[in-house]
Amino acid sequence: ATSCPQNVNISGGTFTLSHGWAPGSLLIYSCPQGLYPSPASRLCKSSGQWQTPRATRSLTKAVCKPVRCPAPVSFENGIYTPRLGSYPVGGNVSFECEDGFILRGSPVRQCRPNGMWDGETAVCDNGAGHCPNPGISLGAVRTGSRFGHGDKVRYRCSSNLVLTGSAERECQGNGVWSGTEPICRQPYSYDFPEDVAPALGTSFSHMLGATNPTQRTKESLGRKIQIQRSGHLNLYLLLDSSQSVSENDFLIFKESASLMVDRIFSFEINVSVAIITFASEPKVLMSVLNVNSRDITEVISSLENAKYKDHENGTGTNTYAALNSVYLMMNNQMQLLGMKTMAWQEIRHAIILLTDGKSNMGGSPKTAVDQIREILNINQKRNDYLDIYAIGVGKLDVDWRELNELGSKKDGERHAFILQDTKALHQVFEHMLDVSKLTDTICGVGNMSANASDQERTPWHVTIKPKSQETCRGALISDQWVLTAAHCFRDGNDHSLWRVNVGDPKSQWGKEFLIEKAVISPGFDVFAKKNQGILEFYGDDIALLKLAQKVKMSTHARPICLPCTMEANLALRRPQGSTCRDHENELLNKQSVPAHFVALNGSKLNINLKMGVEWTSCAEVVSQEKTMFPNLTDVREVVTDQFLCSGTQEDESPCKGESGGAVFLERRFRFFQVGLVSWGLYNPCLGSADKNSRKRAPRSKVPPPRDFHINLFRMQPWLRQHLGDVLNFLPL
């Protein structure tokens, strides 16, 4: 059988083969960061020869060349230094404005290893126009210098740079330029996941049930699509499985799509997901017309069933046909619902195209996009009803022009991206949907990204400072109520001296709140069973604090979801008729349930809640504790079924000051409080002044460590009595 020669090394780089040395195999070069391969790839022809895309000679020596960033072509009303033809990785360019002009954007920009400038386009503006000066991105030339209502500006890129974004923009009545900022980039440049995730996520997170963000930060670059909670989103996932996509990369496409689906279903909107794989022909694995497209398990299962081999007979890249199948799906749904009905008109549509190259058959995909825009009646007023994200993966044959043509163009947003590899894609999908910036009281949202602060990860977590020195912890369960332990307040009732410290994005120390009202469970009496040899008894160890003011929701302050409420039901994506028992069954669904609490230093620690028959073996060791319970005859009198039990195996134990904090678990990327830290047999912080230092109990310790947490499922009557007008409770 023919095979291609193996003398294809690249100096200073490496290569991979999609199908070995056989005809049809794609050889992809890669270089260390800061360098790019030239050529990027070769294809093994049936003749047994390597073909290099767009090359004149059949086999040029592959080399790693240094990445460079484009130079400014012109900079209005100011100067830039240094003036070079192009800039090396790590090189800076600085901007200054003439008198009377104010610099907007980044005064200094650095060339990054992907051939892209960091920061934002620098603009010297005097604020004279109806729209702000749109600026000229590095490497671009602009024609048009009037910024009044209806005025247009046009852009082109110098030499061999590729334009992404809008080549033409118009100053709209609302003072905003149409489309999206044009960027001129090297053909070999690509996006870093940390840039793509927030850019993608911004545009997405509003689609997913948020109200407007409090402010526009650098991380959240743009308008957020407004879908009310009653609205509906159709999400169409298009996965390229043409020959140039390796089987492994196809698996990562699937995995990334699964992550996306998982995240999307964790939001409180109605969503239908379509899944289409495509090569020469599209294959619809799930249609939005199928009722199962609303069910996460069905959607994930149809994704899992997507086979790479489904397309082995036609291995081209027919992006037009894939987008056309979306158009046909939309058309069918429109016929079904009626073109003039609100049911049809209020659906928002998002298309995510994951591809590794440009379409090479079936005609221009732009035609299908135009049809889609037409059927959805996309105009200036209805621009928010369609978002097309074009994501190219792997730098080899991805066509920037085509991706840019397909992606939506919206002010302050990007919809076209090229990522270096599927690993980067996976990273993006992992981090793109960060709902922690939402300003409404959506519960149980924590920022899960690796660079989030402890408070952003557990924004419900609060510190309570009573009269005594001993602090306690608690959890926000609404914008004004905190749930904590009753034993924190056993030294008297003057709560005017207490303070509750709540997370605040403006201060690493948080913000202090006074307490308007404290509701301490009347059943709590630490000495209630003294005559039974039980020196301390923690039954009914639960309290509620009403803060003097409402907490402003932010990345650092947000309530946790309380089970048995409508709010938690939405977060769990459970049907409307669900009961409290259903929640208990879903959340405490194993004999050992992984859960967490928050340590004194703010970090999240792991425990396992023992359920069912394992609960008794967890709780029984209390009978060996002779200090707290010197004459104990019946352990059942100490550990009642109000308590959850942890502390076996490798569990962390809470310290004394961590009492009252939430015991919580994660489901569907949301957090639910199932208990609160009450008491235990071992204090890992004893004798340590440093809140970062915890000592594990020695293995020989008798009794071994055990920790007991008030089980919120057992406190329902009390919670309902005091929070009935704050939260919406489900039937028991």
Partner: antibody, heavy 122, light 108 residues
């Protein structure tokens, strides 16, 4: 409301294997921490626990029957089953399936099937 | 030994209070649960834990525990309470379940 329904042959020959299946409706067999149990009652006598299974796979059997009892679960069908081998006339009884709950220091069966009579004859 | 002992039969006058008892070493460690069974029917849970009653069970049924004994008390017995009553708990090892022999309650 949870419902349990036993099914299987009403007549089994001595030394053969008795096989019964319990179908659970109105709830998932894998949700929560429940112990799906079999209990039997010989005619005119008291209740005897045969064994229980947890959806995680753990089984708990009556030591007096242990070597003869197999209980297994089929989560896809929302069913659990009992196999009792080498049966004798003493195994003639009404066989009940039930949902067992271990909560705190107590264990109880809160939902029961209506029972099925199995007669062992030679 | 891992067994639960019940009186085989108890009778009570209509409207009076009756106590059905269950004894066994395992009751020092675990609470009993109680079932009512009428002829030809499946058992029905009437009490469990320290003193818990499932929803739908009249409040004339109550449970208690002391030492190695558990009791089910019916205050103001009704004719429909005539049935067999079984107690049940985990055995002393905690690994298995045991039932009492049953008590036949007659309402006179």
């Amino acid at each position: 409301q949870l419902q349990l329904q036993e099914s299987g042959p009403g007549l089994v020959k001595t030394s053969e294997t008795l096989s019964l299946t319990c179908t659970v409706s109105g709830g998932s067999i894998t949700s929560g921490v429940y112990y799906w149990g079999w209990i039997r009652q010989p005619p005119g006598k008291g209740l005897e626990w045969i064994g229980s299974i947890y959806h995680g796979g753990n089984t708990y059997n009556n030591p007096s029957l242990k070597s003869r009892v197999t209980i297994f679960i089929d989560t896809s069908k929302n069913q659990f089953s009992l196999k009792l081998s080498s049966v004798t006339a003493a195994d003639t009884a009404v066989y009940y399936c039930a949902e067992g709950v271990s909560s705190g220091w107590s264990y109880y069966f809160d939902y029961w099937g209506q029972g099925t009579l199995v007669t062992v004859s030679s | 030994s891992s067994e639960l002992t019940q009186d085989p039969a108890v009778s009570v006058a209509l409207g009076q209070t009756v106590r059905i008892t269950c004894q066994g070493d395992s009751l020092r460690r675990f609470y009993a649960s109680w079932y009512q069974q009428k002829p030809g029917q499946a058992p029905v849970l009437v009490g469990y834990g320290k003193n818990n009653r499932p929803s739908g069970i009249p409040d004339r049924f109550s449970g208690s525990t002391s030492g190695n004994a558990a009791s089910l008390t019916i205050t103001g017995s009704q004719a429909e309470d005539e049935a067999d009553y079984y107690c049940n708990s985990r055995d002393s090892s905690g690994d298995h379940l045991i039932f009492g022999g049953g008590t036949k309650l007659t309402v006179l």
